[in-house]
Interface confidence: medium
């Protein structure tokens, strides 16, 4: 059998195989050692007994989408049946005091591979016995502690495979420079040691995407905005836009990145090299936010121009590729920074990302202030309590509710929260009366809210003993 017979039914075209060469991967035309690595079809009854105590599930994830030229990382994690885990030696053991359907196990091991390998690897001094090989016959790499790695992972995509010895979790990174744009399929088959052979325990597949667009996401934050995820924001308050570029392999780390913003409110275009920008909308309505991200990413170099004919010079190629600049001066000549174009030189190519959102701008409560606090005299039966009136003003829209949170002087331990609807006039002046149990210093958080906004002000107040002569003080 060949690898492609074992690993996948989807056969890439000859063109795909030729143009998607993955560095360090091998062609799936290679032979598969079925004696050491038996092949079971889906539904084969032997799968039921491939693992003691149930089935092992393999979970395959990737950090897709990947910008072409960057590295994409695949991670496979094995999930064992209940109560089983891998120990420090790579053996599979039962978790202590864990009860599954079979009850508590007397034997601590599900698979004691340490014992197996001591028995079976004695035939030569190197430990490189005929069975310590991958499905294509290549020997296992002898990393320190390799004997504790008891799972063999075979990754398969684009007509190529990659073999890896590992524990219950492995990661493989692939450079996407030669990968065709669009969705691709990665398949992984996992085997476990079984004496002097191997047994398949899991198969999993996942789609990954290679793109020539920079993957871009924008988070938006605005003070006083009640719900930051509904893309509704308040007029006359700055919104902070933060651009997140999905670049897990740090491919763009050395790129100059430009962010070009159009806020849709006729304020023109704004170009920045900073991933955050603040913008204030001064009108209500619906606006189309557009962002173009541009980066010079490492990319293929253009072919060197042919040597000029003696009669007239050949103009050089007009292209969006840029020669990668080095920190060393260029060769002498009339260009102080001329950089030669050699075939394997690292060049730069413009890459773009786009983000679009429709945001709604509405009136909201912009600001809230406590302008006065008055101690209200209490009748004699409540000598320990103080009533305090807070006179509050606000700017912006008219609030419909008020909440006060009374807490300790550090503003961390809440003692009392009271919310109530309010009916406020156009001037936005209201009085909020609250009770304080006993003297001392309190932190008061006062929020005014409506459907779309929530404005906060805080103050520390000092409530005196119930001596009528003691004045109420703002502690801050």
């Amino acid at each position: 059998k060949r690898f492609h017979d074992v690993l996948g039914n989807e056969r890439p075209s000859a063109y795909m195989r030729e143009h998607n060469q993955l560095n360090g991967w091998s062609s799936d035309e290679n032979d598969w050692n079925e004696k050491l690595y038996p092949v079971w079809k889906r539904g084969d009854m032997r799968w039921k007994n491939s693992w003691k105590g149930g089935r092992v599930q393999a979970v395959l994830t990737s950090d897709s989408p990947a910008l072409v030229g960057s590295n994409i990382t695949f991670a496979v994690n094995l999930i064992f049946p209940r109560c089983q885990k891998e120990d420090a030696n790579g053996n599979i053991v039962y978790e202590k005091n864990c009860r599954n359907e079979a009850g508590l196990s007397a034997d601590p091991y599900v698979y004691n591979w340490t014992a197996w390998s001591e028995d079976s690897d004695g035939e030569n001094g190197t430990g490189q016995s005929h069975h310590n090989v991958f499905p294509d016959g290549k020997p296992f790499p002898h990393h320190p502690g390799w004997r504790r790695w008891n799972f063999i992972y075979v990754f398969h995509t684009l007509g190529q495979y990659f073999q890896k010895l590992g524990r219950c979790s492995v990661r493989v990174s692939v450079n996407t420079a030669n990968v065709t744009l669009g969705p691709q399929l990665m398949e992984v088959t996992v085997y476990r040691r079984h004496g002097r052979a191997y047994v398949p325990i899991a198969q999993v597949k996942d789609v990954y995407v290679v793109t020539d667009q920079i993957p871009v996401f924008v988070t938006m934050f605005q003070k006083n905005d009640r719900n930051s995820s509904d893309e509704t924001f308040l007029k006359d308050l700055p919104i902070m836009f933060d651009v997140l570029i999905h670049d897990p392999s740090h491919f763009l780390n050395y790129s100059t990145i430009n962010y070009k913003w159009s806020f849709g409110d006729n304020t023109g275009l704004f170009v920045s090299t900073n991933h955050t920008v603040n913008h204030t909308y001064v009108l209500n309505g619906t606006f189309s936010l557009n962002l173009t991200v541009k980066a010079a990413a490492p990319g293929p170099c253009p072919p060197p121009p042919p040597p000029p004919r003696p009669s007239k010079p050949t103009p050089s190629l007009a292209t969006t590729l840029k020669s990668y600049d080095s920190n060393t001066p260029g060769p002498a000549g009339d260009n102080p920074l001329e950089l030669s174009r050699i075939p394997d030189e690292n060049c730069q190519i413009n890459r773009y990302g786009h983000f679009q959102a429709t945001i709604t701008i509405v009136e909201g409560i912009l600001e809230v202030n406590i302008i006065q606090m008055t101690d209200v005299l209490m009748p004699v039966p409540w000598p320990e309590s103080s009533l305090i009136d807070f006179v509050v003003t606000c700017q912006g829209s008219i609030p419909t509710e008020v909440c006060t949170i009374i807490s300790d002087p550090t503003c961390e331990i809440t003692q009392n929260t009271v919310c109530s609807p309010v009916d406020v006039d156009e001037m936005c002046l209201l009085t909020v009366r609250r009770t304080f149990n006993g003297s001392g210093t309190y932190c008061v958080n006062l929020t005014l809210g409506d459907d779309t906004s929530l404005a906060l002000t805080s103050t520390l107040i000092s409530v005196p003993d119930r001596d009528p002569a003691s004045p109420l003080r703002m502690a801050n």
Epitope: T256, N258, T319, T320, L321, D325
Partner: antibody
């Protein structure tokens, strides 16, 4: 050799517009950003903005935003800088300068045009 | 924007002197460039990326520094070095220039 040749001096009235050109030769025009710099008589240098000729991606200094427009014509390797709503303090020499590849911070303006004097006077 | 403060704003030195100009950035930058401008002409790049000599520029010119403090040095002043010298940063938009140092020969 690399050369940047700018258009001639201009005299404009306040409120008018001026368009300065910068013709590049001796290198691949689309390989480098083209920046524009203002210098008032006896004063220092002020960066106006830059354009990437490969795709006309522009970047303007906020001080000039809304009044400046940078364009290119790649067929004749020429960059243009248009300044509108001219004021008396726009009287200055305007230089075009070739920036490093893709606006890289490693390379400042390595080649400069000879400058174009713009006089704004009523 | 990043403000570049150049000092001194002017200086007078004799032929053969060692001349040093400093440029301080309001926040940290990766690369500083230095230009020479003679009266009525365009600026000319002398030093790029802090310490690299542009081609055709005599080796008596040098640059150094990092972060916020950068230095430009002429090791042995020549009569043709009389000019105004500018530091500049292309690291952060808008690109900015120092106020200039006018160098006269005594």
């Amino acid at each position: 050799q690399v050369q940047l040749v700018q258009s001639g001096a201009e005299v404009k009235k306040p409120g008018a517009s001026v368009k300065v050109s910068c013709k590049a030769s001796g290198y691949t025009f689309t390989d480098n950003w083209m920046g524009w710099v203002k210098q008032r008589p006896g004063q220092g240098l002020e960066w106006i903005g830059a354009i990437d000729p490969s795709d006309s991606f522009t970047n303007y200094n906020q001080n000039f935003k809304g009044r400046v427009t940078m364009t290119v014509d790649t067929s004749i390797s020429t960059a243009y800088m248009e300044l509108s709503r001219l004021r008396s303090d726009d009287s200055a020499v305007y230089f075009c300068t070739r920036s490093g590849y893709y606006g890289s911070p490693k390379l400042g303006g390595d080649y400069w045009g000879q400058g174009t004097l713009v006089t704004v006077s009523s | 924007e990043i403000v570049l403060t150049q000092s001194p704003s002017s200086l007078s030195a004799s032929v053969g002197d060692r001349v040093t100009i400093t440029c301080s950035a309001s926040s940290s930058i990766s690369y500083m460039h230095w230009y020479q401008q003679k009266s009525g002409t365009a600026p000319k790049l002398l030093i790029y990326s802090t310490s690299n000599l542009a081609s055709g520029v005599p080796s008596r010119f040098s640059g150094s520094g990092s972060g916020t403090d950068f230095t430009f040095t002429i090791s042995s002043l020549q009569p043709e070095d009389a000019a105004t010298y500018y530091c500049a940063q292309w690291n952060s938009y808008p690109c900015t220039f120092g106020g200039g140092t006018k160098l006269e020969i005594k």
